[in-house]
């Protein structure tokens, strides 16, 4: 009962636990290197609690420090393929507003077929994160192989 | 002022900070590809605060969204070994209850000797996580090379 | 009872959301394998909220369980370079006080040019974390390629 009372006065959302985990929807058209993401319980285990998707890109709704993480696996890939098609690079960055454009995280595949990393970074309400995959190899859409997410950590 | 009042009534544990970090105990018997984990301060820097171990597999005790992370390093390994023994794959998934069985995270070693990744995923009380290492290479039991953990993030 | 009273008076900061994200400043002199880090908004997107830097090494100010993460990218590197210069290894550990010295996280580059990982570990006030890069290859100072951080998770 006392817990319920406390909850009434401090709604969970106000703690700022914005969080999202996305799965790959599709790659970009022609010269667009961006990956397009989707999320929601109807799709599987992806979700958005706070952040939103804007044309497949993740938009932040709350200022704060976030843990950003990503894993991308290439679809038809062996260490030979990966080295032949080098450089294949994945970059996560703020792509809008343009005034805040910056690369946050960059990884190359070299002879591997999966990259995975994470970092802490300040993000502001309205920041849109883009994930650019450059090179000729295609990403796997398996939800356990390719995913992208953010977690609000503190103000 | 209302925030301070709410704080008064929320004990720390009720925030749900379930967390576990495990070290490798042993590989599975016969054709069992699962890794068997152990945790506790007597063993080193591993611990369980909330989740439990059930025959070496991690069982969740609180519903919520979790950050799941893993690193596995192969014991006798060079880039040549790794490519010769390809495919060696690590998959983390919910293995019970059977009705919720799903692969959450999958990585192949290709020409590398270590995989490391993390993701956000909803887990429910009673979910048991299994880590399957398929292939003929052996995992290192060094606690700074092979570990597996979860962190409760939000309801 | 006293714990409950203490909880009543805890402002947000006292929940212990210590967090830091650092960028590479420089490598160590001669036989010193340590990487030297820097952080602060004037430098870009790095920051320290709680932990401090002591001669380029990260010192913890609050007891608790932390998520430690790192990514290091080698500067002039291809899969051929990486394998020729093998072993190049990155280890994160507690380097002082000496009584608590331990390796927390270790990764080798093998044929790759980037390593990235994360783990949960208990840390105590006064623990200093060192990141040792052994081998003859140099780390990139690009802030999206090489970074090191910690996040307080729970007491």
């Amino acid at each position: 009962q006392r817990f319920a009372q406390a909850q009434q006065q401090l709604p969970l959302e106000s703690l700022g636990w914005d969080v999202a985990e996305l799965q790959l929807n599709h790659t970009g058209p022609q010269q667009d290197p961006r990956l397009y993401w989707q999320g929601g319980p109807a799709l599987g285990r992806s979700f958005l609690h706070g952040p939103e998707l804007d044309k497949g890109q993740l938009r932040i709704h709350r200022d704060g420090i976030y843990m950003v993480h990503i894993q991308v696996t290439l679809a038809i890939c062996s260490s030979t393929t990966a080295s032949r098609h080098h450089p294949t690079t994945l970059a996560v960055g703020i792509c809008s507003p343009a005034s805040r454009s910056i690369s946050l995280l960059r990884l190359s595949f070299h002879q591997g077929c999966t990259i995975a990393s994470q970092r802490l970074t300040p993000l502001a309400r309205g920041d849109t994160l883009c994930t650019n995959l450059t090179g000729t190899l295609l990403p796997s859409r398996n939800t356990d192989e390719t995913f992208f997410g953010v977690q609000w950590v503190r103000p | 002022q209302r925030f301070a009042q709410a704080q008064q009534q929320l004990p720390l544990e009720s925030l749900g900070w379930d967390v576990a970090e495990l070290q490798l105990n042993h590989t599975g018997p016969q054709q069992d590809p699962r890794l068997y984990w152990q945790g506790g301060p007597a063993l080193g820097r591993s611990f369980l605060h909330g989740p439990e171990l059930d025959k070496g597999q991690l069982r969740i005790h609180r519903d919520g969204i979790y950050m799941v992370h893993i690193q596995v390093t192969l014991a006798i390994c060079s880039s040549t070994t790794a490519s010769r023994h390809h495919p060696t794959t690590l998959a983390v998934g919910i293995c019970s209850p059977a009705s919720r069985s799903i692969s959450l995270l999958r990585l192949s070693f290709h020409q590398g000797c270590t995989i490391a990744s993390q993701r956000l995923t909803p887990l429910a009380r009673g979910d048991t996580l299994c880590t399957n290492l398929t292939g003929t290479l052996l995992p290192s039991r060094n606690t700074d090379e092979t570990f597996f953990g979860v962190q409760w993030v939000r309801p | 009872q006293r714990f409950a009273q203490a909880q009543q008076q805890l402002p947000l900061e006292s929940l212990g959301w210590d967090v830091a994200e650092l960028q590479l400043n420089h490598t160590g002199p001669q036989q010193d394998p340590r990487l030297y880090w820097q952080g602060g908004p004037a430098l870009g997107r790095s920051f320290l909220h709680g932990p401090e830097l002591d001669k380029g090494q990260l010192r913890i100010h609050r007891d608790g369980i932390y998520m430690v993460h790192i990514q290091v990218t080698l500067a002039i590197c291809s899969s051929t370079t990486a394998s020729r210069h093998h072993p190049t290894t990155l280890a994160v550990g507690i380097c002082s006080p000496a009584s608590r010295s331990i390796s927390l996280l270790r990764l080798s580059f093998h044929q790759g040019c980037t390593i990235a990982s994360q783990r949960l570990t208990p840390l105590a006030r006064g623990d200093t974390l060192c990141t040792n890069l052994t081998g003859t290859l140099l780390p990139s100072r690009n802030t999206d390629e090489t970074f090191f951080g910690v996040q307080w998770v729970r007491p």
Partner: nanobody
Framework: QVQLVESGGGLVQPGGSLRLSCAAS????????MGWYRQAPGKQRELVAL???????NYADSVKGRFTISRDNAKNTVYLQMNSLKPVDTAVYYC???????????????????WGQGTLVTVSS
């Protein structure tokens, strides 16, 4: 350090069977896994089968269903039962042990491989 001695090789007709043995001596308590590798003339050495200290087994795809690896802890011996042998199974078969030894003064393990001298298996009519 562990020492390994193989036996049981020889000439066998296609479709026949053989059982290889590998006896371990020395610091056997440090053995993490034992296995059999083979090397055919002009080819790379390849894993045939592996058994870990917890009883886990793994096989190369080419021998699954035909070969069985087992161990006798009392005799510190690992066996490879080879059935339905084919000419492509002709090779020198090596016993292998992976040692997991504690590095003195630390809480770390060092992993080492030890090899037997090899035993020739010829499958021919």
């Amino acid at each position: 350090q562990v020492q390994l001695v193989e036996s049981g090789g020889g000439l066998v007709q296609p479709g026949g069977s053989l059982r290889l043995s590998c006896a371990a001596s020395g610091s056997i308590f440090s053995i993490y896994a034992m296995g059999w590798y083979r090397q055919a003339p002009g080819k790379q050495r390849e894993l045939v089968a592996l058994i870990t200290n917890s009883g886990g087994t793994n096989y190369a795809d080419s021998v699954k269903g035909r070969f069985t690896i087992s161990r006798d802890n009392a005799k510190n011996t690992v066996y490879l039962q080879m059935n339905s042998l084919k000419p492509v199974d002709t090779a020198v078969y090596y016993c292998n042990a992976v040692e997991e030894e504690v590095v003195a003064g630390t809480d770390r393990y060092r992993y080492l491989e030890v090899w037997g001298q090899g035993t020739l298996v010829t499958v021919s009519s």
